[in-house]
């Protein structure tokens, strides 16, 4: 369950891949489309709202006894749009949504080496968004496996302003 | 509860090595991002290593790097600081800590052991 | 690496007064930003977490503010337990990074 309906905090910040590629929304036929792409140097980054949130997974799930806190987040890169995960797709998509958001909307945050982040599908354990053919995707990572795989590693690079939503 | 044991502190000379041992119980380690802190007497805290809960690490600070060795033995639930080529200045009290988060760093350390000394001299 | 400047680095106060520590960093930290008290010959333990969010168990009278580089940690009421070293830790990029410590010494 997440901890309250209310982030802890917010923050606004663009998102790259490990390789330095530039994850871009763009608005196509009425619906947004998600673009992993080189951008060229005067190309302003797209900003994306990541609101953080408490969970605990139960002790019976921890393994120790212990109710383990996680930190969930949200990511919307404009108002009322939200990325989600498709697992009968294996896709990563934008949708508009009210609050409460769909469990589909929540990934845990998982920080690797250094100042790289993944997400792992809070429907889904041992799903996370990743890079694929120049798209995000939901990858399936096997835990027995370096979870260090570069495909599923991306950047976060904080804007600092004001945490009002965008656009 | 939640408990972090450190042991294995001492007086060693200048050049000689010591094994830190922090055994825990209420958790399973593995989970969790594990780090080192140590504190000079009458000093502040200083970050020495970490393990990432999710994989990676470790990872030293400057400092240490080259002469210490982090390790955890998940079978033991048990994390280990191995410390080569000491110096004066490795000199203080070694904490190890928990990540708040399972999986994340952004909380900070919300469990820390009660500390072991390591005192360098000839 | 980011640095993280504390201050004052110590205080002289009395039971009941409003204290107040800040803690900058060298560079923004959104507001990934952890809260120390250590009393003598002990562990530190947290007070403060993601800047304003107080950890399980400890006093209401302890409050956190602040994002991007300047924080604030507050206590409304001194009580005689509060006097102690306090540290703030930034952990919003690897290493992590403490300030230097604020003393809080009974006036």
């Known amino acids: 369950s997440i901890t309250g309906i209310s982030p802890i905090t917010e923050s606004l910040a663009s998102l790259s891949t490990y390789n330095d590629q530039s994850i871009t929304f763009a608005l196509e036929d009425e619906s947004y489309e998600i673009y992993v792409e080189d951008l060229k140097k005067d190309k302003k980054k797209d900003k994306v709202l990541l609101s953080y949130y408490e969970s605990q997974h139960p002790s019976s799930e921890s393994g120790d006894g212990v109710d383990g806190k996680m930190l969930m987040v949200t990511l919307s890169p404009t108002k009322d749009f939200w990325l989600q995960a498709n697992n009968k797709e294996h896709s990563v998509e934008l949708h508009k949504c009210e609050k409460p958001l769909p469990d589909q909307a929540f990934f845990v945050l998982h920080n690797r080496s250094f100042n790289c982040v993944s997400f792992e599908c809070k429907t889904d354990p041992g799903v996370f968004i990743g890079v694929k053919d120049n798209h995000l995707a939901l990858i399936k990572v096997d835990y027995s496996e370096n979870l260090g795989s570069e495909n599923i590693l991306f950047k976060l690079s904080e804007i600092l302003e004001h945490h009002h939503h965008h656009h | 509860e939640v408990q972090l044991v450190e042991s294995g502190g001492g007086l060693v000379q200048p050049g000689g090595s010591l094994r830190l041992s922090c055994a825990a119980s209420g958790i399973t380690l593995s989970s969790y991002g594990m780090s080192w802190v140590r504190q000079a007497p009458g000093k502040g805290l200083e970050w020495v290593a970490s393990?990432?809960?999710?994989?990676?690490?470790?990872y030293y600070a400057d400092s240490v790097k080259g002469r210490f060795t982090m390790s955890r033995d998940n079978s033991k639930n048990t994390l280990y600081l191995q410390m080569n080529s000491l110096r004066a200045e490795d000199t203080a009290v070694y904490y190890c800590a928990k990540d708040r988060y399972s999986g994340s760093y952004y909380g900070g350390f919300d469990y820390w052991g009660r500390g072991t000394l390591v005192t360098v001299s000839s | 690496d980011i640095q993280m400047t504390q201050s004052p680095s110590s205080v002289s106060a009395s039971v009941g007064d409003r204290v107040t520590i800040t803690c900058r960093a060298s560079q923004g930290i959104t507001s990934w930003l952890a809260w120390y008290q250590q009393k003598p010959g002990k562990a530190p333990t947290l007070l403060i977490y993601?800047?304003?969010s107080l950890q399980t168990g400890v006093p209401s009278r302890f409050s956190g503010s602040g994002s991007g580089t300047d924080f604030t940690l507050t206590i409304s009421s001194l009580q005689p337990e509060h006097f102690a070293t306090y540290y703030c830790?930034?952990?919003?990029?690897?290493?992590?990074?403490f300030g230097g410590g604020t003393k809080v010494e009974i006036k």
């Open positions: 993601a800047a304003s």
């Open positions: 393990i990432f809960g999710s994989g990676g690490g470790p």
């Open positions: 830790q930034q952990a919003n990029s690897f290493p992590p990074t």
